[in-house]
């Protein structure tokens, strides 16, 4: 499987929602010898390689924001930590997961990683990773919503988030 | 913050088997592996296996295999490692470690570690 | 299984100075090369995960590079709390291998 990012670049104003996705493509093992780490983290461009670095989102390591799950089971973070800072993190049964971000501020700009993790119960692990970039923009050139900007391989054209 | 709690030290038999605990608090304990691994008398660090408590069934290295048995409560948070037939050279510090995803997330927090001595 | 050498097996230093440890793995393992510090007596701890990043609390003295097979940990200005063993360790592949550890002693 594969993790696709549907959009590469999200501008959004300050005080703004903004929903982050990822998108699982390809056959997904839905054995019970299989399982899904899924979770969510902001890094860097390093120099080998984009998304090593794990940093957390809003004082949330990637492991407090982590789901776990068979196949494509419906998850959600627990509750109580993330929304206590503005963060839910969900994925759904069709291979969609994101990362919800509340009241955006200028702090909140940067790279951002998805990771998924297939882990089998004979000791093979396969780990893939997507990177988008948020730039949360304040005063008369900002957006009066989020507009998003597709990931290089689709269509090239702007969409303005929901 | 992640604590892993170790069993006491245990002085032991050739021949015999030893149980070593490692009770996890304070994160999520059936989604992450725990790793045992074990370190001699001014010797280097040595992988033995680990186990996924969602999984139930555990990893060995094959040096272990048929000698270590790793197993894990996710009621009580707890990993245990049994070594059995055990020789002089098992005479070590074993430690618990979590992974921090799958099996080859890297050791992120690690138990104090559980000297057994192998003596006659 | 991959297998990790390090270099040197030990080495003498003062404080200040700038020290590096090498490791080699025996086949290209991506990035995928992490480095913990060990005191006597005491558990492992990690300093740096996926061969350059730091870990949460580590002091930025402490940097990792490489790719592949060859790969560095440099303490950039030796501190007293520095004197330990260091192991380089694999998770590219299972089982998880270790390097046999560089001991970092006081000159």
């Known amino acids: 499987f594969k993790v696709a990012t549907p959009y590469s670049l999200y501008v959004c104003p300050e005080g703004q929602n903004v929903t982050l996705t990822c998108r699982l493509l390809g056959p997904v093992d839905k054995g019970h010898d299989v399982t899904f780490y899924k979770t969510w983290y902001r890094s860097s461009r390093g120099e080998v390689q984009t998304c090593s670095e794990r940093r957390p989102i809003r004082n949330l390591t990637f492991q407090d924001l982590h789901l776990h799950h068979g196949g494509h089971q419906a998850a959600n973070t627990s509750h109580d930590l993330a929304q206590r800072h503005g963060l839910e993190s969900a994925s759904d049964h069709h291979g969609n997961f994101s990362i919800t971000m509340r009241n955006l501020t200028l702090l909140d700009s940067g790279l951002y990683c998805c990771l998924v993790v297939e882990i089998r119960h004979h000791h093979s692990e396969h780990r893939v990773h997507g990177a988008m970039e948020l730039q949360v923009q304040t005063g008369k050139d900002a957006p009066s919503n989020c507009v998003v900007y597709p990931s290089s391989s689709q269509d090239s054209e702007n969409i303005t988030a929901a | 913050q992640v604590q892993l709690v170790q069993s006491g030290a245990e002085v032991k038999k050739p021949g015999s088997s030893v149980k070593v605990s490692c009770k996890a608090s304070g994160g999520t304990f059936s989604s992450y592996a725990i790793s045992w691994v074990r370190q001699a008398p001014g010797q280097g660090l040595e992988w033995m296996g680990g186990i996924i408590p969602i999984f139930g069934t555990a990893n060995y290295a094959q040096k272990f295999q048929g000698r270590v048995t790793i197993t894990a409560d996710e009621s009580t948070s707890t990993a245990y490692m049994e070594l059995s037939s055990l020789r002089s050279e098992d005479t070590a510090v074993y430690y618990c470690?979590?992974?921090?995803?799958?099996?080859?997330?890297?050791?992120?927090?690690w138990g104090q570690g559980t000297l057994v001595t192998v003596s006659s | 299984d991959i297998q990790m050498t390090q270099s040197p097996s030990s080495l003498s230093a003062s404080v200040g100075d700038r020290v590096t440890i090498t490791c080699r793995a025996s086949q290209s393992i991506s990035n995928r090369l992490n480095w913990y510090q060990q005191k006597p007596g005491k558990a492992p701890k990690l300093l740096i995960y996926s061969a350059s990043s730091l870990q949460s609390g580590v002091p930025s003295r402490f940097s990792g590079s490489g790719s592949g097979t060859d790969f560095t940990l440099t303490i950039s200005s030796l501190q007293p709390e520095d004197f330990a063993t260091y192991y380089c360790q694999q998770n590219h592949d299972n089982p998880i291998t270790f390097g046999q550890g560089t001991k970092v002693e006081i000159k």
């Open positions: 470690a979590r992974n921090t995803f799958g099996w080859s997330g890297e050791l992120d927090y």
